[in-house]
Amino acid sequence: MKVLQEPTCVSDYMSISTCEWKMGGPTNCSAELRLLYQLVFQSSETHTCVPENNGGVGCVCHLLMDDVVSMDNYTLDLWAGQQLLWKGSFKPSEHVKPRAPGNLTVHTNVSDTVLLTWSNPYPPDNYLYNDLTYAVNIWNENDLADSRIHNVTYLKPTLRIPASTLKSGISYRARVRAWAQHYNTTWSEWSPSTKWYNSYREPFEQR
């Protein structure tokens, strides 16, 4: 049994780190493999993660952790029974993928404005809470070429756009993702999309 592609891990900087790797051939990850992880510096537990299959030769493991701090460093050992397949380390603060924003809501009852709001995926005491910026993707359900990205570089999880910038009588969808500049993170996954109908009509004298 051989590792084809070594484990790579990302942390949500809260409670879960996700490690993925590929094996040299078809593997029943949960039956044959275990990923052990332990904090360096501390008198701490060696934890065991049972991986799941991720395609024929791929495995994925979700490592449960307490809130992450910048100096955390974990040793990682991938075992197949009594055989050590791979040994490595992982510093969560250097490989952060934020959680996806949630509760994306569209408010169209404000005249001439479409207001989008969503929730910051972190509690206020998390280091990422005040560091997230967002990208909002809005697209026309009937015309995928009619798609735009709005970068939200301020902290408040809201975006206002003039309804007049969208086509009237058309259904639109929006989704949002996040990243944290000071932690040099990757983008989060997109939030679930939400749909609304743009009923805005220009005033008669402007037609």
Partner: antibody
Framework: EVTLKESGPVLVKPTETLTLTCTVS????????VHWIRQPPGKALEWLGV???????DYNAAFKSRLTISKDNSKSQVVLTMTNMDPVDTATYYC????????????WGQGTTVTVSS | DIQMTQSPSSLSASVGDRVTITCRAS??????LAWYQQKPGKAPKLLIY???TLAEGVPSRFSGSGSGTDFTLTISSLQPEDFATYYC????????FGQGTKLEIK
């Protein structure tokens, strides 16, 4: 509900061996480590050692030569054994549950007071 | 071993006061610090870990800050039930506690 309860002798003679039992409920010893901490009268807390969920142990170097921590998962019991007791070992002894990946203590027993005297 | 020094060793304050307790480590412990509250005849209770993360069920008037060697526990508005002894604990192996700060009613 998570609970831990220490039990054992109230009085121990110098040079004797102390055996304390921590009986837990509301969680499994196969999932959590359990620490022992003591507090001499009017003094600060002192970490003695831990037994992890997998059965491995870590000890405070100051007590390593005379301390053993073991457990019986099926009985939900952790046992502390400290040899060659001395009057300076008079203290309240606590067992406490380890919180996740951090060696901090989220649930504690109420403590048992042990006096070492002849 | 890393030594933890708390200050002050005792302090008197009134209900509603803002109180700060400090803990200094003899060497860098990063953010590996916890705070506990202990009332007479009772076991300690975890308040904060990772220097600033509030433990479950702890009121938001408690907050922690600091990293490296200098840390503080702040109680923004003292309540009658907050009068107790407070301990810091680092968890760079081996674990050690501070000597405690006794918070008394003025």
């Amino acid at each position: 509900e998570v609970t831990l309860k220490e039990s054992g002798p109230v009085l121990v003679k110098p040079t004797e061996t102390l055996t304390l039992t921590c009986t837990v409920s509301g969680f499994s010893l196969t999932n959590y480590g359990v620490h022992w901490i003591r507090q001499p009268p009017g003094k600060a807390l002192e970490w003695l050692g831990v037994i992890w969920s997998g059965g491995s142990t870590d000890y405070n170097a100051a007590f390593k030569s005379r301390l053993t921590i073991s457990k019986d998962n099926s009985k939900s019991q952790v046992v502390l054994t400290m040899t060659n007791m001395d009057p300076v070992d008079t203290a309240t002894y606590y067992c406490a549950r380890n919180k996740g990946t951090r060696p901090v203590f989220d649930y504690w027993g109420q403590g048992t007071t042990v006096t070492v005297s002849s | 071993d890393i030594q933890m020094t708390q200050s002050p060793s005792s302090l008197s304050a009134s209900v509603g006061d803002r109180v700060t307790i400090t803990c200094r480590a003899s060497e860098n412990i990063y953010s590996y610090l916890a705070w506990y509250q202990q009332k007479p005849g009772k076991a300690p209770k975890l308040l904060i870990y990772n220097a600033k993360t509030l433990a479950e069920g702890v009121p938001s008037r408690f907050s922690g800050s600091g990293s490296g060697t200098d840390f503080t526990l702040t109680i923004s508005s003292l309540q009658p039930e907050d009068f107790a002894t407070y301990y810091c604990q680092h968890y760079v192996s081996p674990l050690t506690f501070g000597q405690g700060t006794k918070l008394e009613i003025k």
